[in-house]
Interface confidence: low
Amino acid sequence: AVDLTLLANLRLTDPQRFFLTCVSGEAGAGRGSDAWGPPLLLEKDDRIVRTPPGPPLRLARNGSHQVTLRGFSKPSDLVGVFSCVGGAGARRTRVIYVHNSPGAHLLPDKVTHTVNKGDTAVLSARVHKEKQTDVIWKSNGSYFYTLDWHEAQDGRFLLQLPNVQPPSSGIYSATYLEASPLGSAFFRLIVRGCGAGRWGPGCTKECPGCLHGGVCHDHDGECVCPPGFTGTRCEQACREGRFGQSCQEQCPGISGCRGLTFCLPDPYGCSCGSGWRGSQCQEACAPGHFGADCRLQCQCQNGGTCDRFSGCVCPSGWHGVHCEKSDRIPQILNMASELEFNLETMPRINCAAAGNPFPVRGSIELRKPDGTVLLSTKAIVEPEKTTAEFEVPRLVLADSGFWECRVSTSGGQDSRRFKVNVKVPPVPLAAPRLLTKQSRQLVVSPLVSFSGDGPISTVRLHYRPQDSTMDWSTIVVDPSENVTLMNLRPKTGYSVRVQLSRPGEGGEGAWGPPTLMTTDCPEPLLQPWLEGWHVEGTDRLRVSWSLPLVPGPLVGDGFLLRLWDGTRGQERRENVSSPQARTALLTGLTPGTHYQLDVQLYHCTLLGPASPPAHVLLPPSGPPAPRHLHAQALSDSEIQLTWKHPEALPGPISKYVVEVQVAGGAGDPLWIDVDRPEETSTIIRGLNASTRYLFRMRASIQGLGDWSNTVEESTLGNGLQAEGPVQESRAAEEGLDQ
């Protein structure tokens, strides 16, 4: 099965903190078609559960194998079906998560139900807020069944589905008649394509016997393991707080997997992480229980103790799920559940066994998927175990599949199946991409699409001057980083090729196609200095500069002047395209502003050293501040402002600007124009009741003038929350969640 997990954060006190994350453990997942494979898709599926339109959700990609959905503004945004799609080609897989509103009238006792073909499925909706009306059950959005409200059993409405078949799969819902659909209980029914313990096209093959709540995939017979378990049969527990097919992922946050729902490819569905349970996965397992949703009971024997994440921890001398097996029966030890080798390699596989009587070399054998039995070439005998070593013939793709190590002694026998994945070394399909160039270096992106298998462990970049017969230079780089080729010759063409490797012996792939990259012209080295400047108006500045005298031609195409307005955090750049220029006029500057000024020489796209900076203050413009600003509350949503015109005006006022801000608020202030300059009062409407506001104002002639003093006033009474301050009233609309 594809290693794809959809995590839902269920700490639902605030919908804005809710997020969904899709994590792929697949090699090179999610980087898009121009890199390692098709991207991960994470979206809300509104086909069955439709919710009111709201602001679009925000999708953020975190690295190559993770995508997160945020931006939920109200509880109703969360309700419904979400899906993540990952994996490439025939392995493309959709993982589904169904979210129920915690405040719904009806709540599912269990959201995901995985059943076998021919089973009876029972969906149970618990009454959360009782209504004395019929309950309507729907399947994939279509009417299915009605129950009278008197038919509730122990506060639950049950839907029994006998003899289910794969087409019965889908989203089921239970809703009170006349109630909002958002108050429904939503369920997901997954019907495996085979009866219990079977898989394959005709359901003729036997499942491996998935442990710890793992579910046998009806197409490929692999166990889809619950979060927190790994191995061919889910026999191995991950360390606390880890998940993914190889336990390679870690739950975010300090409280580990608490409050997270995990959804995995069908036929598993969704559950809490190992050690957690409850509708929001925030409750620890009860004593004696462990695993995902705490569904498993330890029942440890022979002095074993129960760990809520991993199950029975056995004392010395015992093993097995319940510590029921004596160490005297032969036992395969520490066999990896999955091994990976590269095509055409001849690996050595070790299989260790212990027991009494002690296993010898001939008692351990290795069986390939095609039934071929390999005998060990040598055995290492230690006091506590025998390790048999098998030399495997050159691997072909057909060797992928389940291998088995078997030990037989007079004390009994044991076998351990493990999966062997034969991988094809990666070969680049395209040439590397030039990102930036300088006179003596090239910055190259080696990430290209490739044939074969990931993950990419190393990237080798081979390069040499064009048309050269000299040896290639090689640089080994991290697959996720751009490469800088250094100490090159200026204005020279280089042939560059990529070679990719995957982990393991024989993982190096063939070289990719070459590309030509040319270094830039030399960088300018001269540092100018500012000779002087003078102000030619409130928004104009004349600047002059000099260069040191050096022999030879000037290396440069022109000058770049930079003005930095620190108050506003803005930079202005002026290009002077002649290398002979030594003066420039800068216009359109902001009056009354303190600028930091410098100049530097440029050549091609390269900048030389900047001159020492100069500090310039432009004279201010604009009218003086309005006088005697006063605020008076009129009602629970209106405040009147009064003021006196500024004195000594340089011209007629075009308008006033009022700034409104909630006292102590962190948001941006709101500016409101008063377009009748003869006025000396205005009423600000649409304010929130019982709220303290700050006001100040300024006049505008051609430019904005100085701010007045700030005044503070509170609205009266207790009323509805308004939409925001305006000068004319606007009716407040009641939101969905109000």
């Epitope: 006190t13 122990d154 506060g155 409280s255 608490r258 925030q282 409750e283 009860a286």
Partner: antibody, heavy 126, light 107 residues
């Protein structure tokens, strides 16, 4: 070792106030519901109050509603019970207990106090 | 708040079986938990959920429930089982409620 240790009990006059504390150790306090249960001399157990892991949701018995306040400090692994306007009928041993309900579909819906403190005596008398 | 009603007292011969009940509306939705309390000691949880025992509780204790009635059974009572037993559940408003208690005497 999983442990709950109450403190703060004692003799107080009617109308007075008292604050009980319960220090938790040996388990992840912040993920469990916690509660207070009392037992008057020679009487049965009486549930007093409980609080959810975040501390944002609290429940009270009718007999103490409006007078008692349950709270918790997850950073200190401590549960509190602030008792105001105390009456003679509040005289009891007060136990702090860990609540690991409300169960699930497999083991049934329930609420259970699986860990109890040794109790602290509160006497309200003039 | 709703109450849970228990048998006030029961007695059982050593090694025999005793069953006592707990009745109340909240038991329709919630399984009770059962506690054993010996004089001068804090209560100890013996059964929770459908019929779950915490580790360290002997398997002679078992629980069952149907409708609004639940029961605790001690199969093969021992002298150390002599104690007060309380049932506890949760009502519709999320409050806990304890039963009135049953005094068990082992003869």
């Amino acid at each position: 070792e999983v442990q709950l240790l109450e403190s703060g009990g004692g003799l107080v006059q009617p109308g007075g106030s008292l604050r009980l504390s319960c220090a938790a150790s040996g388990f992840t306090f912040s993920i469990y519901q916690m509660g207070w249960v009392r037992q008057a001399p020679g009487k049965g157990l009486e549930w007093v109050s409980r609080i959810y892991p975040s501390g944002g949701v609290t429940k009270y018995a009718d007999s103490v509603k409006g007078r008692f306040t349950i709270s918790r400090d997850n950073s200190k692994n401590t549960l509190y019970l602030q008792m105001n306007s105390l009456r003679a009928e509040d005289t009891a041993v007060y136990y702090c207990a860990r609540d690991f309900g409300p169960g699930d579909l497999w083991s049934g819906y329930y609420d259970a106090f699986d860990i109890w403190g040794q109790g602290t005596m509160v006497t309200v008398s003039s | 708040q709703s109450a849970l009603t228990q048998d006030p007292a029961v007695s059982v011969a050593l090694g025999q079986t005793v069953r006592f009940t707990c009745q109340g509306d909240s038991l329709r939705n919630y399984h009770p938990s059962w506690y054993q309390q010996k004089p001068g000691q804090a209560p100890v949880l013996v059964i929770y959920g459908k019929n779950n025992r915490p580790s360290g509780i002997p398997d002679r204790f078992s629980g069952s429930s149907s409708g609004n009635t639940a029961s605790l059974t001690i199969t093969g009572a021992q002298a150390e089982d002599e104690a007060d037993y309380y049932c506890n559940s949760r009502d519709s408003s999320g409050n806990h409620v304890f039963g009135t208690g049953t005094k068990v005497t082992v003869l």
